[in-house]
């Protein structure tokens, strides 16, 4: 029987900021509750010369009205114990999207190929998660090759999510399009 | 709803060529793999090879490596085999199906959509 | 490559009557990568269970698929007649994928 509760969840063994570095393309996605990118998500890491961590998003997200905007998300990452476990400040360019903090750990990486990303936001009392969010990246916009997505697949079921993921369309939505000259 | 919608059947002459093709609706195209699989007249499912739309990788089972070249054209959502110097054992009905990438968690790569099949006739 | 055998290749069973099929493969196959097809003659093969024992959409509750390792099952618990096909095993768990070369069902 697996264990769901967040506690037991293995993230990546001495997580290396800088070789994570770079631009990751969304491929997969299991939502939280709410507000959320939808697809041609793609994101940007990179390390300062004190070694934080940042990063930057780009996404569509449809809003209540039902309007789709391509948002720009900003997010910077305090470390923690564990150097693949991060608090997570997040924030949009403009106004009107989301900001908040969440956890931000790297379930698993080899930096160059794949990555899992997962964040709890809300424990039940038990110690499972619920309300969860998880992304699979890839550096190629593409497609992860087979072999990773075993890897990736593995993981997505000891993070108890195996079900839940979404294939994230890239179809060049945001190309050049941002909040700011959507509105 | 999803589709796979391939071309009519073929009669060609041993030593030649035929390029069949499946077309797919109702789905992003480039995020899901395109398998090809044969069917003998009353014999099982061969596997062929696949393909990755998104990237134009592709994979051949070592049977089918020099038979069979697949391609996709992303601009109009269509996957291609060409079968090149045939002979009365390539005479099959050949599907494409599609499946997911593992990483979409469901399916396990299972073929979830098939096309309707292609006869190919090989006679002199 | 892993070669994949049914047993039996052809069989009958009687309306109403419990149906279990094999399929046993000559190397380990992890769970999640073994599925299984019907196909009716004139038709195109149908995903009828993913990762040995989930059903796919549409697929009565009578069927269930079971089993690990090398050795994996289809069992109809009663028989009906729109369930006289064949049916394959297939292993996405390494390349070349394989099928299985079927068992016939046949109404008695």
């Known amino acids: 029987e697996r264990d769901c509760r967040v506690s037991s969840f293995r993230v990546k063994e001495n997580f290396d900021k800088a070789r994570f570095s770079g631009t990751w393309y969304a491929m997969a996605k299991k939502d939280p509750e709410g507000l959320f990118l939808q697809d041609n998500i793609v994101a940007e890491f990179s390390v300062d010369e004190t070694g934080q961590m940042s990063a930057t998003a780009k996404g569509r997200v449809r809003l209540l009205n039902n309007w789709d905007v391509c948002a720009d998300m900003v997010g910077t990452f305090t470390d923690t114990e564990d150097p693949a476990k991060f608090k997570m400040k997040y924030w949009g360019v403009a106004s009107f999207l989301q900001k908040g903090n969440d956890d931000h750990w790297i379930v698993d990486t080899d930096y160059d190929t794949y990555a899992v990303q997962y964040s709890c936001r809300l424990l039940n009392l038990d110690g499972t998660c619920a309300d969860s969010y998880s992304f699979v990246f890839s550096r190629d916009p593409n497609g992860l090759p087979p072999e990773a997505q075993k890897i990736v697949r593995q993981r997505q079921e000891e993070l108890c999510l195996a079900r839940q993921y979404r294939l994230i369309v890239h179809n060049g939505y945001c190309d050049g399009r941002s909040e700011r000259n959507l509105l | 709803q999803v589709q796979l919608q391939q071309s009519g059947p073929e009669l060609v002459k041993p030593g030649a060529s035929v390029k069949i093709s499946c077309k797919a609706s109702g789905y992003s195209f480039t995020r899901y793999y395109i398998h090809w699989v044969k069917q003998r007249p009353g014999q099982g499912l061969e596997w062929i090879g696949w393909i990755f739309p998104g990237s134009g990788n592709t994979e051949y089972s070592e049977m089918f490596k020099d038979k069979a070249t697949l391609t996709a054209d992303t601009s109009s959502s269509t996957a291609y085999m060409q079968l090149s110097s045939l002979t009365s054992e390539d005479s099959a009905v050949y599907f494409c199906?599609?499946?997911?990438?593992?990483?979409?968690?469901?399916?396990?790569?299972?073929?979830?959509?098939w096309g309707q099949g292609t006869s190919v006739t090989v006679s002199a | 490559q892993i070669v994949l055998t049914h047993s039996p290749p052809i069989m009958s069973a009687s309306l109403g009557e419990r149906v279990t099929m094999t399929c046993t493969a000559n190397s380990s196959v992890n769970s999640s990568y073994l599925h299984w097809y019907q196909q009716k003659p004139g038709s195109s093969p149908k995903l009828w269970i993913y990762s040995t024992s989930n059903l796919a959409s549409g697929v009565p509750a009578r069927f269930s698929g079971s089993g690990s390792g090398t050795s994996y099952s289809l069992t109809i618990t009663s028989m009906e007649a729109e369930d006289a096909a064949t049916y394959y095993c297939?292993?996405?768990?390494?390349?070349?994928?394989?099928f299985g070369a079927g068992t016939k069902l046949e109404i008695k």
């Open positions: 199906a599609r499946s997911p990438p593992l990483y979409f968690g469901n399916y396990e790569g299972a073929m979830d959509y």
């Open positions: 297939h292993q996405y768990h390494r390349s070349p994928l394989t």
